[in-house]
């Protein structure tokens, strides 16, 4: 941009600087040259000489008009055509921006990551503001009324050693350019209700020999929670079908899941827990794929039989994703939920 | 309640440095975000640096690359750090609670002098 330039005169933009995409703008330049009165005065736009809507105001004084200006940035200068000089002589020059007020901040969550060692606070901004938006965090304890202020931009980590005064807190995000300010709702939150387990993993996976073979998954997590609740999501590669089975886990000891399953087939395994009776979820773990083995003599395989579980299982629901384009977005097909919690939340689908 | 103080104020030549201080009490300093203010003679609040609880630094086109702004949690002092001063600082600053933005100030001190002048 023009930002250290040695002007011989003046430009100004009404309604300023930075205005509102789509606005009518005006521009003035006004020379202030020794030994030179102008023929004309031009006005360049990003290096490009402008050709309409220009109007000379008076000797000194000239303004162009910009109808609907909507380009984000733009870098304005203009010069002066003086009697007997070959090249134009340099005016002034500005940088220019156009863009919206921000949004009101949405979906503000706030989670703690076992271990982590930080609260962290995400939310959507919103549409594109186009120029600099601030995103100030406010988090105020309902205990000592103190208040705490973060700068962000979409996201924030809050150490919980800054959390130590009190347990409930109000969090809420500001945003902030120079053509506007929203605040989003502000979110109630208990450091204990927050907590996400330590991640969760599928280590491996086996299929037994038995005359009915079942496929045993192995899992773990370093958590430190006693209540944890956790899903387990499997599907064949090749179907857009999710099963979900549910279980109530201790991981003193690492976990073993019994299913079975189809023969000679190849299955996408994923697991995800949150504390029981809280509403925070861990993502969904790495797939895991697993082989199952080709069937050994004639067996009368159903795959609708209740599939047995080392853990208490509630139930078996099915999710499928609406489209290979789409992998996020989940829909439920099927479903009996016990525990009153959607089993769709949070998917992050693999084909 | 909360108290803020200035100083360190002064005259000083163009091109010269300063170090402002801001003695801070009535509330926890350490989680706390702080800015530095100023205004100019028949001039408005103008922001010219703020910290927030997490350290995190910010500063006005007007002032980047000659201030620091700097948060004692042990001394419970705010600084300000200000180098290769020009003509235009000449202002009364203030060191205030809150971030520079957002009508988020919550007070502010007395403020201290600043006068650049040859």
């Known amino acids: 941009g023009i930002t250290s330039i040695n002007c011989s005169g003046d430009m100004w933009v009404e309604p300023g600087e930075i205005f509102q995409m789509g606005m009518n703008v005006s521009i003035y330049c006004q020379e202030a040259l020794k030994h030179c009165r102008p023929r004309n005065l031009y006005f360049y736009k990003n290096g490009f000489k402008e050709e309409f809507d220009i109007t000379r105001i008076n000797r000194t004084t000239a303004r162009i008009w910009y109808k609907g200006f909507s380009e984000p940035h733009a870098y304005m200068h203009c010069t002066a055509e003086c009697p007997g000089h070959f090249q134009e002589t340099l005016i002034c020059g500005k940088d220019i921006s156009s863009g919206h007020p921000p949004d009101a901040p949405s979906n503000l969550t706030c989670v703690i990551y076992e271990y982590s060692g930080n609260m962290t606070c995400t939310w959507n901004t919103g549409k594109p503001t186009y120029i600099d938006t601030k995103y100030i965090v406010h988090v105020k304890s309902l205990e000592t009324e103190e208040e705490q202020q973060y700068l962000a931009s979409s996201y924030v980590k809050i150490s919980t050693d800054s959390l130590q005064g009190s347990r409930k807190y109000l969090v809420w995000v500001q945003a902030v350019n120079s053509l506007g300010m929203e605040n989003s709702q502000q979110l109630h939150v208990h450091l204990d209700d927050i907590v996400i387990p330590s991640a969760s993993i599928i280590s491996r996976a086996e299929t037994t020999n038995d005359t009915v073979p079942k496929t045993i998954v192995y899992w773990k997590s370093k958590t430190m929670i006693e209540k944890v609740f956790c899903e387990m999501r499997y599907k064949t590669t090749t179907n857009q079908t999710w099963s979900v089975k549910e279980f109530d886990a201790n991981f003193t000891y690492v976990q073993q899941s019994e299913f079975y399953l189809e023969p000679d087939s190849k299955y996408v395994f994923q697991v995800r827990c949150q504390e029981t009776g809280k509403r925070n979820w861990q993502p969904w773990s790495s797939p895991f794929v697993h082989q199952t083995s080709q069937e050994t003599g004639k067996r009368n395989w159903q795959p609708w039989s209740s599939p047995f579980v080392h853990q208490t299982s509630q139930t078996v629901s099915q999710v499928t994703a609406k489209s290979s384009h789409e992998p996020q977005k989940m829909e439920m097909l099927s479903a009996t939920i016990f525990r009153g919690h959607p089993a769709s939340g949070n998917h992050q689908d693999i084909g | 309640q909360v108290q803020l103080q200035e100083s360190g104020g002064g005259l000083v030549q163009p091109g010269g440095s300063l170090r402002l201080s801001c003695a801070a009490s009535?509330?926890?300093?350490?989680?706390?975000?702080m800015t530095w203010v100023r205004q100019a003679p028949g001039k408005g609040l103008d922001w010219v640096s703020g910290?927030?609880?997490?350290?995190?630094?910010v500063y006005a086109d007007s002032v980047k690359g000659r201030a620091t702004i700097l948060k004692d949690n042990a001394k419970n002092t705010l600084y300000l750090q200000m180098n290769s001063l020009k003509t235009e600082d000449t202002a009364v600053y203030y060191c205030?609670?809150?971030?520079?933005?957002?009508?988020?100030?919550?007070?502010r001190g007395q403020g201290t002098q600043v006068t650049v002048s040859s």
């Open positions: 205030a609670t809150g971030l520079p933005w957002g009508n988020t100030w919550r007070t």
């Open positions: 009535g509330f926890t300093f350490s989680s706390s975000a």
């Open positions: 910290i927030d609880s997490g350290g995190t630094t």
